[in-house]
């Protein structure tokens, strides 16, 4: 028997520095977690103690903090190289800055293979990107070889900016021939490493013949055997065992997100490459694990540029950006309109001739807006200004909801109107009319939404049974501010880009902004 230790991360999302327990900015260092310096300490400890170790990443290193905004992926290549990762799969967020934003900072700089079997380049890009990412890689580990085959969510064109010269194929269809190739190369220990979410990970384990282990990402799934060490609730045991169609027991793992845990899986193979046993657990990277001093020093050196960036002008406003609680928690405010417009703009994807865009709607809890921006400061808008408006470090996510769920959400928006509570919704691509003289739960008298399957966008009445795509803060997707109906009834949830980054990119693109209050939210006569 031969034993392999798989260390794995996924959905790190730019958390190079240690974070608080909820993966936001570290406030109390003695209680902080994760970060590449602490990760390196643990990885090195395991490498010293065990003979056959692979360090793998299942995608979405890109996007999530000011580190990515400033360094645009160079930080990912640098610190993953420093940690000596053995392989990485491409996630959807790796395409957030387009293909060029993947090729230059990461693909050309990484000293480890970057993988995806179901992304096929065509046209002029094919020769440019050739060899920079691979469908699979055979890695020598001790006296043996291990095949790693990569995959990426086929939804990436809707979630990021891969352009028109990359085709995202069905994962299972694309993986099978690559695994077959590995078998013909006499590689009998094969790991599928990828970024399509836990449901697809399980399908791959079930359907792709020859895959021994699946290491996944995208769904931020936390698996654990025994008593979990922090606040994440396990979605199942670690590893999660799937019985394949050909009768094998295939371990499937994921390690939550944000570099909070290091996945730790021990696999025992027989001489024919069959998995005899698998066990392990994610390791919580808490403050009991010291940060490696040399990596920490490097982090501090790279940090300097971030502090300078915060005060640089991103663009200008020629109007007052009203982010006051008096406005945003009671009525339409132009700061809410600006943020929603940025959220929609960030999700422009012309993927189908029938649709001008795949999503037209945005909702945003007014309580999430925490500062105005005064135009009388020469109109200057900085990252620092935006960090005061959006101080909680969330993301703007894509969900799919039924019209009936949206109706409930808008009723919730005004169910206790007038108390300066945070659930009052700011909107984009939506026209809502409330009648506050009616009883709570029956106050939405008109709800029109912007069509997507149209060449000239116009507002149509919301249909209760139709499924709509909506951009919203992750806080709302998770049921925050009492929006339990969103959490309970959402049909799909894909995590998006860092909130401040979305707005800063929009302002930089527009150069000069002048959002208005324009009748997106109205109160019917006699009630307000």
């Amino acid at each position: 028997a031969w034993e392999l230790t798989i260390l794995h991360t996924n959905d790190v999302h730019s958390r190079l520095e240690q974070t608080s327990e909820d993966s936001s900015k570290c406030v109390n260092a003695s209680r902080c977690m994760g970060g590449v310096a602490r990760l390196f300490t643990k990885v090195q400890q395991i490498r010293r103690a065990e003979p056959n170790v692979l360090l793998l990443d299942a995608g979405d290193q890109y996007q999530g903090t000011i580190w990515f905004t400033v360094y645009k992926g160079a930080e990912v290549a640098h610190f993953m190289n420093a940690l000596r990762y053995d392989a990485m799969a491409l996630g959807n967020h790796e395409f957030d800055n387009g293909v060029e934003g993947l090729i230059e900072p990461l693909l050309k700089e990484a000293k480890f293979p970057i993988l995806s079997a179901n992304i096929k380049a065509k046209g002029p890009l094919a020769s440019q990107i050739s060899g920079l990412y691979l469908p699979y890689k055979v890695l020598p580990v001790g006296d043996e070889v291990v095949g790693i085959v990569g995959y990426t969510s086929k939804e990436t064109p809707f979630l990021s900016n891969p352009g028109t010269n990359l085709v995202f194929e069905d994962e299972i269809t694309a993986l099978q021939p690559e695994v077959d190739k590995l078998k013909t190369l006499n590689v009998n220990k094969i790991i599928a490493l990828g970024h399509s979410g836990f449901e697809m990970d399980k399908l791959i384990a079930q359907k792709v013949r020859g895959v021994d282990v699946v290491v996944g990402g995208h769904s931020n799934t936390f698996l654990y055997t025994g008593n979990p060490p922090s606040k994440e609730v396990p979605a199942g045991k670690y590893p999660f065992i799937v019985t394949s169609d050909d009768g094998r027991k295939v371990p499937v793992v994921q390690a939550y997100a944000f570099g909070k845990y290091l996945g730790y899986l021990k696999i025992e193979f027989d001489e024919r490459g069959n998995v005899i046993s698998s066990h392990g657990n994610p390791i919580l990277l808490n403050s009991s694990i010291p940060e490696d001093p040399s990596i920490k020093a490097d982090i501090n050196k790279w940090r300097i540029k971030l502090d300078n960036y915060s005060t640089q002008e991103l663009g200008k406003t020629i109007v007052y950006l009203d982010g006051s609680s008096q406005s945003c928690r009671f009525r339409e405010c132009n700061m809410g309109n600006l943020i929603c417009d940025a959220m929609i703009n960030n999700n422009l994807r012309h993927t189908d001739e029938m649709f001008w865009n795949h999503v037209s709607m945005c909702i945003l809890n007014g309580g999430g807006i925490r500062s105005p921006i005064d135009e009388r400061n020469n109109g200057t808008i900085t990252w620092e200004n935006l960090a005061a408006v959006l101080p909680f470090g969330g993301t703007f996510d894509l969900v799919q909801l039924k019209g009936s769920t949206l109706k409930k959400a808008f009723e919730h928006s005004v169910h206790r109107y007038g108390q300066s509570t945070g659930e009052f919704l700011q909107v984009g691509g939506i026209h809502v009319v409330y009648d506050l003289s009616r009883k709570p739960g029956d106050r939405v008298v008109k709800l029109d939404v912007l069509c997507t399957k149209c060449r000239v966008p116009s507002y149509d009445p919301l249909k209760m049974d139709e499924v709509y795509k909506v951009i919203l803060p992750n806080f709302l997707a998770n049921g925050g501010d009492g929006f339990q109906m969103i959490k309970d009834e959402l049909l799909r949830h894909d995590s998006g880009d860092q909130d401040i980054n979305v707005v800063s990119t929009y302002i930089s693109k527009m150069k000069v902004i002048y959002p208005a209050v324009e009748g997106r939210i109205k109160f019917s006569t006699g009630s307000h």
Epitope: S325, Q326, R370
Partner: antibody, heavy 117, light 106 residues
Framework: EVQLVESGGGLVQPGGSLRLSCAAS????????MHWVRQAPGKGLEWVAV????????YYADSVKGRFTISRDNSKNTLYLQMNSLRAEDTAVYYC??????????WGQGTLVTVSS | AIQMTQSPSSLSASVGDRVTITCRAS??????LAWYQQKPGKAPKLLIY???TLQSGVPSRFSGSGSGTDFTLTISSLQPEDFATYYC????????FGQGTRLEIK
């Protein structure tokens, strides 16, 4: 590290006034709604007042309405509670807190106000 | 104002016990309920918010449930450091605390 430090408590006669302060550090004070909560000796917790992050909304418990005024100075990272027409039943430890009952919930250690003749 | 009624007002239990404290609101408050722990001479500490969400750093033996008017705080296996006073608090309207439940060693 988040810190909230209350000050200004002490002994005051009935009908008198007192101004409590709460100095905040370790977080973006101007982004958070702030509360005052009190606890009479040997009794339970009683919410007193709240002020929104930008000062534009204030709400008070019925027991202090018209007598107490909450205010803040975001440039000084400080929350205040001006207490007038004090009564014996206002005797309590007064805590300042951020966004109670939410993720960003932090409390100070409290300052004792004693109203007695 | 919405009134919060906690029960029991005090209870005795031993280390390792499973303990349940209930809180009733005088009208529906959806899931706008929090649970606090307070030890003598100390500030209250948030355990649970939005009825069932565990606050960062709080051990998983604490859990909350309920919606509308009836809510429960459960400690699955009492530890020595859990002996304290527990308060529920609604934030549906201007905040209001329950009268507290004193948990003492049997």
């Amino acid at each position: 590290e988040v810190q909230l430090v209350e000050s200004g408590g002490g002994l005051v006669q009935p009908g008198g006034s007192l101004r409590l302060s709460c100095a905040a550090s370790g977080f973006t004070f101007s982004s958070y709604d702030m509360h005052w909560v009190r606890q009479a000796p040997g009794k339970g917790l009683e919410w007193v007042a709240v002020m929104s992050y930008d000062g534009s909304n204030k709400y008070y418990a019925d027991s202090v309405k018209g007598r107490f005024t909450i205010s803040r100075d975001n440039s000084k990272n400080t929350l205040y509670l001006q207490m007038n027409s004090l009564r014996a039943e206002d005797t309590a430890v007064y805590y300042c807190a951020t966004e109670i009952a939410a993720k960003g919930d932090y409390w100070g250690q409290g300052t004792l106000v004693t109203v007695s003749s | 104002a919405i009134q919060m009624t906690q029960s029991p007002s005090s209870l005795s239990a031993s280390v390792g016990d499973r303990v349940t404290i209930t809180c009733r609101a005088s009208q529906g408050i959806s899931n706008y309920l929090a649970w606090y722990q307070q030890k003598p001479g100390k500030a209250p500490k948030l355990l649970i918010y939005a009825a069932s969400t565990l606050q960062s750093g709080v051990p998983s033996r604490f859990s909350g449930s309920g919606s509308g008017t009836d809510f429960t705080l459960t400690i699955s296996s009492l530890q020595p450091e859990d002996f304290a006073t527990y308060y529920c608090q609604q934030s549906y309207s201007t905040p209001h605390f329950g009268q507290g439940t004193r948990l003492e060693i049997k």
